[in-house]
């Protein structure tokens, strides 16, 4: 599947679009929103009752280059005693971003839209049990 | 912008950076995986902090349709099946990177737009201070 | 450091009504949720109703529905308990709450007497 065209009978294309040639399409990569601050809980990671640790992955041949991805840290749950409860299950939580892959081929270098599922976080669900016969 | 490496055989003409504006292609690379997290599980269902999950659309976007998640309780789940106020469901947010059509209304011209979204929602034992 | 100002506590006959404030101020906070908590004499203290910041989303006690009204003022860091039709085992310290996610503030209380 493509990126939708806007197909929709409100929607006239305007004179101003930029010419692309077939098959492509133009990205701008300068991000909107780039310098907002998110006020982000401080320590849910550490304090949530499935808590998880952080990594960075870096690929240089990637927009951007760095993601962040998060692992449980444990397969239950943290209960109020603070030991960990495995009739419950610390799950991640995960959500699709964009990137933009750098390929080389030779000499040439091309550009492609790539989804990525970045793992945010975690939950603690109660796990569906069923009885093997 | 990002450092790449470069094959040491080809012109030296290629910028080490990624540019700013790039032609890509229209297909998208892992295109295919579910981005409606109603189907693809139910811990939004069976999480001790539930939530619900809201379509936000908007036509000038792509991907056009993301879900945001809403905490369907101030507290946690208990045990019991009853709401713990001495818990807290907190709602996890992470920036994500879509497609914004600039010029507006444009087919095959977009910018790159860094949005916060709340994918889910976790328990958290909060820190208790007593204000004197 | 964080503060919270109760106020609106006192005496009143059953069927009568009383409105709770509670300010916070202190250092910049980004606020979960505001509300209010109460207890009696040897029990536990309990959730009486609570106002989500971002979206004022209001949650309340069966005890306490269709009786308590929470409202904000988010210039004014301020959430308000309306309490119309008091029973006598509404008789508690009521502690306004201010959760800021990981941290919890709780305030000193203030006496809600009802009489029949």
């Known amino acids: 599947r493509k990126i939708p065209k806007v197909g929709h009978t409100f929607f006239q294309k305007p004179e101003s679009c930029p010419p692309v040639p077939g098959g492509s399409m133009k990205l701008d990569i300068g991000i909107i929103n780039e310098n907002q601050r998110v006020s982000m809980s401080r320590n849910i990671e550490s304090r949530s009752t499935s808590p998880w640790n952080y990594t960075v992955t870096w690929d240089p041949n990637r927009y951007p280059s760095e993601v962040v991805q998060a692992q449980c840290r444990n397969l239950g749950c943290i209960n109020a005693q603070g030991k960990e409860d495995i009739s419950m299950n610390s799950v991640p939580i995960q959500q699709e971003t964009l990137v933009v892959r750098r390929k080389h081929q030779g000499c040439s270098v091309s550009f492609q839209l790539e989804k990525v599922l970045v793992t945010v976080g975690c939950t603690c669900v109660t796990p569906v049990i069923h009885h093997v016969q | 912008g990002i450092t790449i490496p470069r094959n040491p055989g080809c012109p030296n003409s290629e910028d080490k950076n990624f540019p700013r504006t790039v032609m890509v292609n229209l297909n998208i690379h892992n295109r295919n995986t579910n981005t409606n997290p109603k189907r693809s599980s139910d811990y939004y269902n069976r999480s001790t902090s539930p939530w619900n999950l809201h379509r936000n659309e908007d036509p000038e976007r792509y991907p056009s349709v993301i879900w945001e998640a809403k905490c369907r309780h101030l507290g946690c789940i208990n045990a019991d099946g009853n709401v713990d106020y001495h818990m807290n469901s907190v709602p996890i947010q992470q920036e994500i990177l879509v497609l914004r059509r600039e010029p507006p209304h444009c087919p095959n011209s977009f910018r790159l737009e860094k949005i916060l979204v709340s994918v889910g929602c976790t328990c958290v034992t909060p820190i208790v201070h007593h204000v004197a | 450091e964080v503060q919270l100002v109760e106020s609106g506590g006192g005496s009143v006959q059953a069927g009568d009504s009383l409105r709770l404030s509670c300010a916070a101020s202190g250092r910049a906070f980004s606020i979960n949720w505001f509300g209010w908590f109460r207890q009696t004499p040897g029990k536990e203290r309990e959730f009486v109703a609570g106002i989500r910041w971002s979206d004022a989303y209001t949650e309340y006690a069966n005890s306490v529905k269709g009786r308590f009204t929470i409202s904000r003022d988010n210039a004014k860091n301020t959430v308000d308990l309306q309490m119309d039709s008091l029973k006598p085992e509404d008789t508690a310290v009521y502690y306004c709450?201010?959760?800021?996610?990981?941290?919890?503030?709780w305030g000193q209380g203030t006496q809600v007497t009802v009489s029949s």
């Open positions: 709450v201010l959760d800021l996610s990981t941290v919890r503030y």
